[in-house]
Interface confidence: low
């Protein structure tokens, strides 16, 4: 019953938000030069002073403004806008994107290491050495260190003593030869800004998790990158959003966003930069994309020669070369309850993760049965018009009622027959969100430049993060989709009902094969495959919508799978999704068997 009430409450809240309650306060703005009226949010907004820009669509006070840097610039420790370094050299790849408060960081591309460091980059990259015959890899080469070899121990084949040694050599065949730099002429990292140049990660982490640091995602009072209006937009007019500069396109939120660049040697242009769509790049013939990026590929590799049943085993982002190994056999389910602290895992086993160097894939290179339609921005399309609202309302009432009645009857019958306590409310423990950027933050009032600041109000948060959500899954595996952080764009305003998670209900009872996609900590996509031979009337309790981070300062709000704690008695569902803690051996998220 509680789930029904919660769903109805959410829908009612959505309906309220679809019809804004605030009356326009235009009169309070008139004649007040420090404020302006924003028709989109129907309220008076504080006008940020010159040189400062809003941290949200409709600032209310001076603290809602902060110094704003342009794309490819970051706010340094001295609070100055400083150009981010560029990774445009062929031997460099982007390790971390240019954020509002930290520079882009470049590192040597896979197969190379840095011999001469530079601030946030590398001045000289050399190929990793290859271990000579009779030697094996002790430590594989990383972006910072060369390969370390050691003599092969007796009785072990020197060729394949470790998986690293079975990979194709990443440089010439002369073992331990003096590494050669790729571009000796370029001895220092470029710090000049690139206007629309090589900025693969400006659209960092795709728009699935909408990079808050992406400068294009900032709500701005006047001009956007690529636009140079000579004054703030006239109120209610879209005049300053008509045309973007070359190499910029007008995105769906009406912002001029830099088109990605295909200037890397391993990329070719698939579609050109148009006025309303980004250039798209793809790996050149003979290469496949190992690490996807929005409208591009962050890392192309030659077609790998892998056995049919192999999976990519990523290692340390770009730090180590990718190796291929057979996938692990199915492991025993770990039925341990969550530790007392209830922290969500920072990651699961690497064998199940597809690492994305600062970008989450837009076109996910993995089969998924999860019904997520991706729009051209990579956002799940959840169109919640008024019609859909009523359809959903009716559906929820019908499905919820029948689910409850069916479940109740079945559970009670079983309870009498087996004297078993099968109703487990899912304890949705709020994950402690980890900040991706480890640098100390300036102050609690400084918000991430792109993050949405329309934080849930108390009532809304109360609904969206109910500590106990009784989930009766006799009708199948119902789960809430993890939605992306909403954009903070000038047209954003308070989130509409489309921002609410939409329950999806499957009517299959057996062989539920749910492949869920979790966006973790900005640069990892976890593909959790749950294969469960489930008895009839038993489903999976999936993740509820995670709470938005209080200050929205993390580069990306992680959408973690929820974890269960020791369940209380008296529920209907005896199957739960157990997600491994970081560092646990079991590599797969598994379904716990019936207790």
């Amino acid at each position: 019953m509680r789930v029904l009430l919660a769903a109805l409450g959410l829908l009612f809240l959505g309906a309220l938000r679809a019809f804004p309650q605030d009356r326009p306060f235009e009169d309070t703005c008139h004649g007040n030069p420090s404020h302006y009226y924003d028709k989109a949010v129907r309220r008076c907004c504080y006008r940020c002073p010159m040189g400062l820009f809003p941290t949200q669509q409709c600032p209310q006070r001076p603290t809602d403004c902060r110094k704003q840097c342009e794309p490819d610039y970051y706010l340094d420790e001295a609070d100055r806008c400083t150009a981010c370094v560029t990774c445009s050299r062929d031997d460099l790849v982007e390790k971390t994107p240019c954020a509002w408060n930290s520079s882009r960081v470049c590192e040597c591309r896979p197969g190379m290491f840095c011999s001469t460091s530079a601030v946030n980059s590398c001045a000289r990259c050399f190929f990793h050495s290859v271990c000579p015959a009779g030697m094996i890899v002790k430590f594989p080469g990383t972006a910072q260190k060369n390969t370390v070899c050691e003599p092969a121990s007796p009785g072990v084949s020197p060729a394949c003593a470790s998986p690293e040694n079975c990979k194709e050599p990443s440089s010439g065949t002369i073992p331990q030869a003096k590494p050669t730099p790729v571009s000796p002429a370029t001895s220092s990292a470029s710090t000049m800004p690139v206007r629309g140049g090589t900025r693969l990660a400006q659209e960092a982490a795709s728009k699935l998790t909408r990079a808050p640091d992406s400068p294009s995602s900032v709500g701005r009072p006047s001009s956007d990158p690529g636009l140079s209006p000579t004054q703030p937009c006239p109120e209610g007019s879209g005049d300053c959003r008509k045309q973007c500069e070359p190499d910029y396109y007008l995105d769906e939120a009406g912002r001029c966003t830099a088109c990605v660049s295909c200037s890397r040697d391993d990329l070719v242009e698939k579609t050109p930069c148009a006025w309303n769509s980004s250039r798209t790049c793809e790996c050149r013939p003979g290469m496949i994309c190992a690490t996807s990026a929005t409208n591009s590929c962050a890392r192309c590799v030659p077609y790998p020669i892998c056995a049919a049943e192999t999976v990519t085993k990523p290692q340390d982002m770009a730090e180590k070369d990718t190796t291929f190994e057979a996938p692990p056999l199915g492991t025993q389910p770990d039925c341990n309850p969550t530790p007392e602290n209830g922290e969500a895992p920072a990651s699961t086993s690497p064998t199940q993760s597809l690492l994305v160097d600062s970008q989450a894939s837009k076109t996910l290179p993995i089969p998924t049965s999860a019904p997520v339609a991706l729009s051209s921005t990579g956002k799940p399309v959840l169109d919640a018009g008024p019609v859909l609202f009523w359809v959903i309302l009716v559906l929820v009432v019908v499905v919820g009622s029948s689910a409850f009645l069916l479940c109740h009857r079945r559970a009670c019958r079983k309870r009498i027959r087996q004297k078993l306590h099968l109703c487990y409310p899912v304890q949705t423990s709020q994950p402690k969100l980890e900040l991706v950027d480890s640098r100390p933050r300036r102050s609690s009032t400084q918000l991430r430049s792109g993050a949405s600041v329309t934080e849930p109000v108390a009532e809304e948060r109360g609904l969206m993060s109910q500590p106990l959500m009784e989930t009766c899954h006799s009708v199948g595996a119902a789960y809430l989709e993890s939605l992306p952080l909403q954009d903070a764009s000038p047209a954003g305003g308070p989130s509409s009902p489309r921002d609410l998670p939409e329950p999806r209900v499957s009517t299959e009872h057996t062989n539920n094969k749910i492949e869920k996609i979790y966006i973790m900590k900005a640069d990892t996509v976890i593909v959790g495959t749950v294969k469960a031979e489930l008895p009839e009337g038993r489903g999976l309790a999936g993740p509820a919508e995670p709470e938005l981070e209080e200050e929205l300062e993390a580069d990306h709000t992680p959408h973690y799978p929820e974890q269960e704690t020791e369940p209380p008695l008296g529920s209907c569902s005896d199957v739960m999704l157990s997600v491994e803690e970081e560092g646990k051996e079991d590599p797969l998220p598994t379904a716990a068997s019936g207790k």
């Epitope: 007040n32 030069p33 420090s34 010159m50 342009e70 806008c81 150009a83 703030p232």
Partner: antibody
């Protein structure tokens, strides 16, 4: 040492055009917003225009909006002010100034010596 | 007419303390920092006070700034003859930068 040196001033007829330049040195030019501030003879200071470090944001005083255009060339460490449709009241010493100390701050911490623009028939 | 209002002139004798006022509104001084500039005769302006009361390096501690509501003031203690100059207050306005009309300080 931070230095700002204006040039391009002179005598021009009403309705005419003039382009002022400001050569900057001694700091990372592209990291700073820059402004033009003018001072009519015997009068006070009047802010004219502002441009951000990467040229994405530009602001103008109402009195010059639509007639003046601020721009910069970061590769040349130079700030420009293109003045069109000049009027007699635009006669002033034009200073180029570096826009300030940082977060929540809008001071002009360094100024050039100025260049005189005289609009007269 | 300037957005910020300053007295056109002020005077004092050497060693004396002089205060120059600056009055604005909620949209400039009221919601933003105040800056003070000194312009010696025939020279470019020089930043004297930033962030209401902070002195850049090289500015003597005889100069101090304060702000209260929509008004600000510059105080010069131990007045010296070399302090004779024009003093301008300034503040960020909405998408602009506003200066006071300036106060000519005369050291008698």
């Amino acid at each position: 040492e931070v230095q700002l040196l204006e040039s391009g001033g002179g005598l021009v007829q009403p309705g005419g055009s003039l382009r002022l330049s400001c050569a900057a040195s001694g700091f990372t030019f592209s990291s700073y917003g820059m402004s033009w501030v003018r001072q009519a003879p015997g009068k006070g200071l009047e802010w004219v225009s502002y441009i951000s470090g990467g040229s994405y944001y530009t602001y103008y005083a109402d009195s010059v909006k639509g007639r003046f255009t601020i721009s910069r060339d970061n590769s040349k460490n130079t700030l420009y002010l293109q003045m069109n449709s000049l009027r007699a009241e635009d006669t002033a010493v034009y200073y180029c100034a570096r826009y300030g100390y940082g977060y929540y701050d809008g001071s002009f911490d360094y100024w050039g010596q100025g260049t005189l623009v005289t609009v007269s028939s | 007419q300037s957005v910020l209002t300053q007295p056109p002139s002020a005077s004092g004798t050497p060693g004396q303390r002089v205060t120059i006022s600056c009055s604005g509104s909620s949209s400039n001084i009221g919601s933003n920092y105040v800056y003070w500039y000194q312009q010696l005769p025939g020279t470019a302006p020089k930043l004297l006070i930033y962030r209401n009361n902070q002195r850049p390096s090289g500015v003597p501690d005889r100069f101090s700034g304060s702000k209260s509501g929509t008004s600000a003031s510059l105080a010069i203690s131990g007045l010296r003859s070399e302090d004779e100059a024009d003093y301008y207050c300034a503040a960020d306005g909405p998408y602009n930068y506003v200066f006071g009309g300036g106060t000519k300080l005369t050291v008698l």
